[in-house]
Interface confidence: medium
C-alpha cells in the first residue's frame, strides 16, 4: 500500500513542493518532538497486576537504531497477596511505529519505510472459555 | 545518527551514519498489520482496566489515523465487576514515529514526526505516601 | 508538561453555587486525571475528588459527595468543580492538580498543580 497522496484529495498541491523522482518520496529523518519529555507513571511495569520486562533490540541498518520491546513476566496476573492467579491472563498490548530501514546493494544503499509493531506494555484481562460441545 | 557497518571492497565515501535526508521508496514494508485496534483484541473491554478507544484524525499525518486509549476508571475491575479503588488504572503510553508533511499539502514529502501515544491500561498497586 | 490555571473562585453567600475552572495547556490532558484539592486558613490540604481521563470515572471525598460536581471536557483542556449549598466552612483556596496516576493525586503528590483560586463563604 502506498502512502495516500492527500494533495489529490484533500487540498491543491502547492506549488513549493520538492521535485520528487517517481515512486519514492523525500524523507526529513531530523525529527520533529525529538527532546520532548514523557511523563510515564512510575515503575507501572513493575507494580502491575500483569508486570513486564524491557528488551533492547538493536539494529545498525534501523533508524532509530533502538526499539524497546516489552514481554509479560507472568501468564496469569498477580493478585492481592503477590501470587500468580492463573484464572486471569496477563497479555501484551502492542503499537505500530514506522523505522527507516538501510539495505545494501552491493555498494549501493536504498532507504524503505517499515512498519515496526512494539509491545509497549502488559494488560491484565479476564480469558475467553470456549465451552467445547 | 547512527553509525552502521561499512562494506569494505564499497567506496570510502559513504556517511557511517544516517543522512539527515533521505529518498525512500513508497511502498511501506509491513504495511498490511491491522491498525484499528478495535479489531485486532477486545482487551480494551476485558482488561480489569479497561479503556475507551479515541479516533485522532490528521490528513498531514502518515498514518492519518491514530487510536488514542483513555482509562475508563480510576480504580481497577475486581472479581464482582466492581471498580476497586485500592487499585488504580493508568495509561501505558509510547513514542512512536509518524509521518509529518513537509511543506504542508506536499504528496511526497515528509518529516519524521516523535508522538506520545496512550495505548492501552494496566492496573497497578498504588503508591500509598503515609504523611507525617 | 501540562500547566493549570484556576479561575471562578470569588465571595458568594452561604447557601449559594460556585464553579471553579480549571483550564490546562498541553496536549496530552486527557491522558491526565485531574482532580481538586482545597486549603483553609491553618488547615491541611483536603481532597475534594478526581476524575479519569476518559470522564468515565469520578472518585469524591466521601464528605462533599453531594454537594459537589466533577466534570471535564477534554476539547476545551478544561476541568471543573461545580460547588452548591456553600457553608462557610467552604471557605478555602481550591486547587487544581493532575498526575498519570490516580493514587498520587489521591495522596496530594501529584506532579503538576495549579496556583490556586481563593473562594470566600459568608454567612
Known amino acids: 500500500r502506498k502512502i495516500p497522496k492527500v494533495g489529490h484529495t484533500f487540498f491543491q498541491k502547492p506549488e513549493s513542493c520538492p521535485p520528487v523522482p517517481g515512486g519514492s518520496m523525500k524523507l526529513d529523518i531530523g525529527i520533529i518532538n525529538e527532546n520532548q519529555r514523557v511523563s510515564m507513571s512510575r515503575n507501572i511495569e513493575s507494580r502491575s497486576t500483569s508486570p513486564w520486562n524491557y528488551t533492547v533490540t538493536w539494529d545498525p541498518n534501523r533508524y532509530p537504531s533502538e526499539v524497546v520491546q516489552a514481554q509479560c513476566r507472568n501468564l496469569g496476573c498477580i493478585n492481592a497477596q503477590g501470587k500468580e492467579d492463573i484464572s486471569m491472563n496477563s497479555v501484551p498490548i502492542q503499537q505500530e511505529t514506522l523505522v527507516v530501514r538501510r539495505k545494501h546493494q552491493g555498494c549501493s544503499v536504498s532507504f524503505q519505510l517499515e512498519k515496526v509493531l512494539v509491545t509497549v506494555g502488559c494488560t491484565c484481562v479476564t480469558p475467553v472459555i470456549h465451552h467445547v460441545q | 545518527g547512527i553509525t552502521i557497518p561499512r562494506n569494505p571492497g564499497c567506496p570510502n565515501s559513504e556517511d557511517k551514519n544516517f543522512p539527515r535526508t533521505v529518498m525512500v521508496n513508497l511502498n511501506i514494508h509491513n504495511r498490511n498489520t491491522n491498525t484499528n485496534p478495535k479489531r485486532s483484541s477486545d482487551y480494551y473491554n476485558r482488561s480489569t482496566s479497561p479503556w475507551n478507544l479515541h479516533r485522532n484524525e490528521d490528513p498531514e499525518r502518515y498514518p492519518s489515523v491514530i487510536w488514542e486509549a483513555k482509562c475508563r476508571h480510576l480504580g481497577c475491575i475486581n472479581a464482582d465487576g466492581n471498580v476497586d479503588y485500592h487499585m488504580n488504572s493508568v495509561p501505558i503510553q509510547q513514542e512512536i514515529l509518524v509521518l509529518r508533511r513537509e511543506p504542508p499539502h506536499c504528496p511526497n514529502s515528509f518529516r519524521l514526526e516523535k508522538i506520545l501515544v496512550s495505548v492501552g491500561c494496566t492496573c497497578v498497586t498504588p503508591i500509598v505516601h503515609h504523611v507525617a | 508538561e501540562v500547566q493549570l490555571v484556576e479561575s471562578g473562585g470569588g465571595l458568594v453567600q452561604a447557601g449559594g453555587s460556585l464553579r471553579l475552572s480549571c483550564a490546562a495547556s498541553?496536549?496530552?490532558?486527557?491522558?491526565?486525571?485531574v482532580g481538586w484539592f482545597r486549603q483553609a486558613p491553618g488547615k491541611e490540604r483536603e481532597f475534594i475528588g478526581a476524575?479519569?481521563?476518559?470522564?468515565?470515572?469520578?472518585y469524591y471525598a466521601v464528605s462533599e459527595k453531594d454537594r459537589f460536581t466533577i466534570s471535564r471536557d477534554n476539547g476545551k483542556n478544561t476541568l471543573y468543580l461545580q460547588m452548591s449549598s456553600l457553608k462557610a466552612e467552604d471557605t478555602a483556596v481550591y486547587y487544581c492538580t493532575a498526575d498519570q496516576e490516580f493514587g498520587y493525586l489521591r495522596f496530594g503528590r501529584s506532579e503538576y498543580w495549579g496556583q490556586g483560586t481563593q473562594v470566600t463563604v459568608s454567612s
Open positions: 476524575i479519569s481521563g476518559s470522564g468515565d470515572s469520578i
Open positions: 498541553g496536549r496530552t490532558f486527557s491522558s491526565y486525571v
